[in-house]
Interface confidence: medium
């Protein structure tokens, strides 16, 4: 599936994202923008051997498994297949621990690439929330 | 157990596309990755790709883009490899496998003939 | 793409020898190297995963050893069920790829 902005704005706001460790609805939408452009099947692969999967691009070195990823932790519990679902429910509650694991937001590279200090509120601005 | 299940040997003439097909069963089909590999006498193993069923997401070898294309029913638990513009290059045996960066499971191998 | 250089390509031994079986990467892979074993009309086996690692229910003759470049399968004491081709294959990067395989044959 490939989210509308507003329509994943809400989406993650319902799963609640907004302020989840002191970062804005902005952030997430952002960091999806730019890690996914907004599509939950989207996969990308790594030099490391391991695979970036769903709309925020968790990897499968530290936070699910897909079964094939040299020593992946899988600190979500979780398959990475499950992070390509239209629902971002297993997305959503891995990106929690995942942020709160001491990095924040800085663990997503295209977030800090391309969101961190911008106007992030501009990713929700107009949408019925 | 694990198990994958290859379709039977073809004969194709040249020019003509065929659609092999490979049924998993004894795990998750959705979770792991199926690869596709190819065996030529003398030209050992080669990599084709592979596909994600639960999400239909593809990667191929830049040496097979637009001669195979990868497909996957995850209502039946089975992938397909499609091949196009066949020549008797494409003459070989392909495999199936599931994908866990080694490969523990194999299908039995789809022989394939490209005559005229 | 790395490339997977395996030697000998042919290795002829009595029963009861015992072989190495090298194979060599054109660029450093760590440990992700792993071993098949394949018969005339059969698929590959998995022999060993991670350079070293003992897949299930192979036998304890087959050993795996290296890292970086340099793979080594070793084989204590070779069983006539031993002959066949041998392949590595690596998983650091894509494409995946394999060498082109050591034959072990009947002297």
């Known amino acids: 599936k490939v989210f509308g902005r507003c329509e994943l704005a809400a989406a993650m706001k319902r799963h609640g994202l907004d302020n989840y460790r002191g970062y804005s609805l902005g952030n997430w939408v952002c960091a999806a923008k730019f890690e996914s452009n907004f599509n939950t099947q989207a996969t990308n692969r790594n030099t490391d051997g391991s695979t970036d999967y769903g709309i925020l691009q968790i990897n499968s070195r530290w936070w699910c498994n897909d079964g094939r990823t040299p020593g992946s932790r899988n600190l979500c519990n979780i398959p990475c297949s499950a992070l390509l679902s239209s629902d971002i429910t297993a997305s959503v509650n891995c990106a929690k621990k995942i942020v709160s694991d001491g990095n924040g937001m800085n663990a997503w590279v295209a977030w800090r690439n391309r969101c961190k200090g911008t106007d992030v509120q501009a990713w929700i601005r107009g949408c019925r929330l | 157990q694990v198990q994958l299940q290859e379709s039977g040997a073809e004969v194709m003439k040249p020019g003509a596309s065929v659609k092999i097909s490979c049924k998993a069963t004894g795990y998750t089909f959705s979770t792991y990755w199926i690869e596709w590999v190819k065996q030529r006498p003398g030209h050992g193993l080669e990599w084709i790709g592979e596909?994600?069923?639960?999400?239909?997401?593809?990667y191929y070898n830049e040496k097979f883009k637009g001669k195979a294309t990868f497909t996957a029913d995850t209502s039946s638990n089975t992938a397909y490899m499609q091949l196009s513009s066949l020549t008797s290059e494409d003459s070989a045996v392909y495999y199936c496998?599931?994908?866990?960066?080694?490969?523990?499971?194999w299908g039995q191998g789809t022989t394939l003939t490209v005559s005229s | 793409d790395i490339e997977l250089t395996q030697s000998p390509a042919t290795l002829s031994v009595t029963p009861g020898d015992s072989v190495s079986l090298s194979c060599r990467a054109s660029?450093?892979?760590?440990?992700?190297l792993h071993w098949y074993q394949q018969k005339p009309h059969e698929s590959p086996r998995l022999l060993i995963k991670?350079?070293?690692q003992s897949a299930s229910g192979i036998p304890s003759r087959f050993s795996g050893s290296g890292s970086g470049t340099d793979f080594t399968l070793s084989i204590n004491s070779v069983e006539t069920e031993d002959f066949g081709m041998y392949f590595c294959q690596q998983s650091n990067s894509w494409p995946r790829t394999f060498g082109g395989g050591t034959k072990l044959e009947i002297k």
């Open positions: 596909i994600l069923p639960g999400s239909g997401s593809t």
């Open positions: 660029q450093s892979i760590s440990n992700n």
């Open positions: 496998a599931r994908g866990d960066g080694w490969y523990c499971y």
């Open positions: 991670y350079a070293s």
